[in-house]
């Protein structure tokens, strides 16, 4: 048995670090394999992570880690029974890929303006709190060809847009993705996407 | 919110031991280390050691190894930190905090003093 | 014994800028991560800079800090009466075994 593409891995920079790898041939990885993590730090311990299937080479695991900061580094091992198949690192820190954000709502009852709101994906002690900004799209199912894509690079979750730069009688989706700066991390996953009618119609000029 | 409530003020005599403890709330106990620290009257900050509250593991300052016992009582959230064998420079305000590399939580202190 | 090494005061008007520095050695600020905390009057130590350069939630933005090769600043602008405080930089050492280390203290006086 032996491991075709080493493990990679991402963190969520809050509890959880997904690590990927393949092996050389069809395997049962949770039952023939374990990946063994720990933390390079004083009177920490060694954790077990059991691995899923991913396809038929390919295994996935997602290891537990409490209170994730910057200078956090983890010994990885991988074992098949006895025998080590691989061993290596892992600092979270360098590779984030932040969570997805949530609650995203479209509030159409302001006069002129479409808000919408979501909701950061960290609790305000993590350190990524503070550290998103995202991207806001925003697309047509009535209008192939509109699709924007708006930076939010300020900390509110907010974004308002003037309802008379989009059509109106048709409706609008929407979903948000979120990035860290200071972390050098990846984008998140889109939301969840939500849907609305843009009803507005410009005033009547006399 | 975070909270690290520690125990009331010590007087002991040299030669004694002193148990402090620092009951945690508004976190998940076992999810963050804790460690010790200490601050004589107008001196500065000096580290002790820190616990594991998820299986108890401990690391000592090298200063205080033999004579510092760190614990904790998972059912409770607490920590405890027992220094045995007092002399009247263990006088200082003894601190638990939250944290790995840095300490973002603290207790507000716990005064020690030995004196005859 | 601190092997941190700051200046014991420093002292500014309000609104001024004043800077607070902490020099240490390969084995800890060269080879790590430096911290603030700031320590009120009778109260215990407060977390103002994490990772060299972030802010926790909460801390202003008036602290800032930063690090070159062994050493290590705190800069505070816009002071004011209620920042008067002790300052102390932290980091990890790893000599002669890994354990976290804190600089001597600086009294800041605001004028």
């Known amino acids: 048995m032996k491991v075709l593409q080493e493990p990679t891995c991402v963190s969520d920079y809050m509890s959880i670090s997904t690590c990927e790898w393949k092996m050389g041939g069809p395997t049962n990885c949770s039952a023939e394999l374990r990946l063994l993590y720990q933390l390079v730090f004083q009177s920490s311990e060694t954790h077990t992570c059991v691995p899923e299937n991913n396809g038929g080479v390919g295994c996935v695991c997602h290891l537990l880690m409490d209170d994730v900061v910057s200078m956090d580094n983890y010994t990885l091992d991988l074992w098949a029974g006895q025998q080590l198949l691989w061993k290596g690192s892992f600092k979270p820190s360098e590779h984030v890929k932040p969570r997805a954000p949530g609650n995203l709502t479209v509030h159409t009852n302001v006069s002129d303006t479409v808000l919408l709101t979501w909701s950061n994906p960290y609790p305000p002690d993590n350190y990524l709190y503070n550290d998103l900004t995202y991207a806001v799209n925003i697309w047509s199912e009535n209008d192939p060809a509109y699709s924007r894509i708006h930076n939010v690079t300020y900390l509110k979750p907010t974004l308002r847009i003037p309802a008379s730069t989009l059509k109106s009688g048709i409706s609008y989706r929407a979903r948000v993705r979120a990035w860290a700066q200071h972390y050098n991390t990846t984008w998140s996953e889109w939301s969840p996407s939500t849907k609305w009618y843009n009803s507005y119609r410009e005033p009547f000029e006399q | 919110q975070v909270q690290l409530v520690q125990s009331g003020a010590e007087v002991k005599k040299p030669g004694a031991s002193v148990k402090v403890s620092c009951k945690a709330s508004?976190?998940?106990?076992?999810?963050?280390?804790m460690h010790w620290a200490r601050q004589a009257p107008g001196q500065g900050l000096e580290w002790m050691g820190i616990?594991?509250?998820?299986?108890?593991?401990?690391s000592y300052a090298q200063k205080f190894q033999g004579r510092v016992t760190m614990t904790r009582d998972t059912s409770t959230s607490t920590v405890y930190m027992e220094l045995s064998s007092l002399r009247s420079e263990d006088t200082a305000v003894y601190y638990c905090?939250?944290?790995?590399?840095?300490?973002?939580?603290w207790g507000k202190g716990t005064l020690v003093t030995v004196s005859s | 014994q601190s092997v941190l090494t700051q200046p014991p005061s420093v002292s500014a008007a309000p609104g001024q800028k004043v800077t607070i520095s902490c020099s240490g050695g390969?084995?800890?600020?060269?080879?790590?991560?430096v911290s603030w905390y700031q320590q009120l009057p009778g109260t215990a130590p407060k977390l103002l800079i994490y990772?060299?350069?972030k802010r926790p939630s909460g801390i202003p933005d008036r602290f800032s800090g930063s690090k070159s090769g062994t050493s290590a600043t705190l800069a505070i602008t816009g002071l004011q009466t209620g920042d008067e405080a002790d300052y102390y930089c932290?980091?990890?050492?790893?000599?002669?075994?890994?354990?976290?280390?804190f600089g001597t203290g600086t009294k800041l006086t605001v004028l």
């Open positions: 905090a939250r944290g790995k590399w840095w300490w973002q939580h």
């Open positions: 390969s084995s800890n600020i060269g080879n790590s991560y």
């Open positions: 508004g976190y998940a106990f076992t999810s963050y280390y």
């Open positions: 616990i594991n509250p998820s299986g108890g593991s401990t």
């Open positions: 932290g980091t990890w050492d790893t000599s002669p075994v890994d354990r976290p280390i």
């Open positions: 990772d060299n350069n």
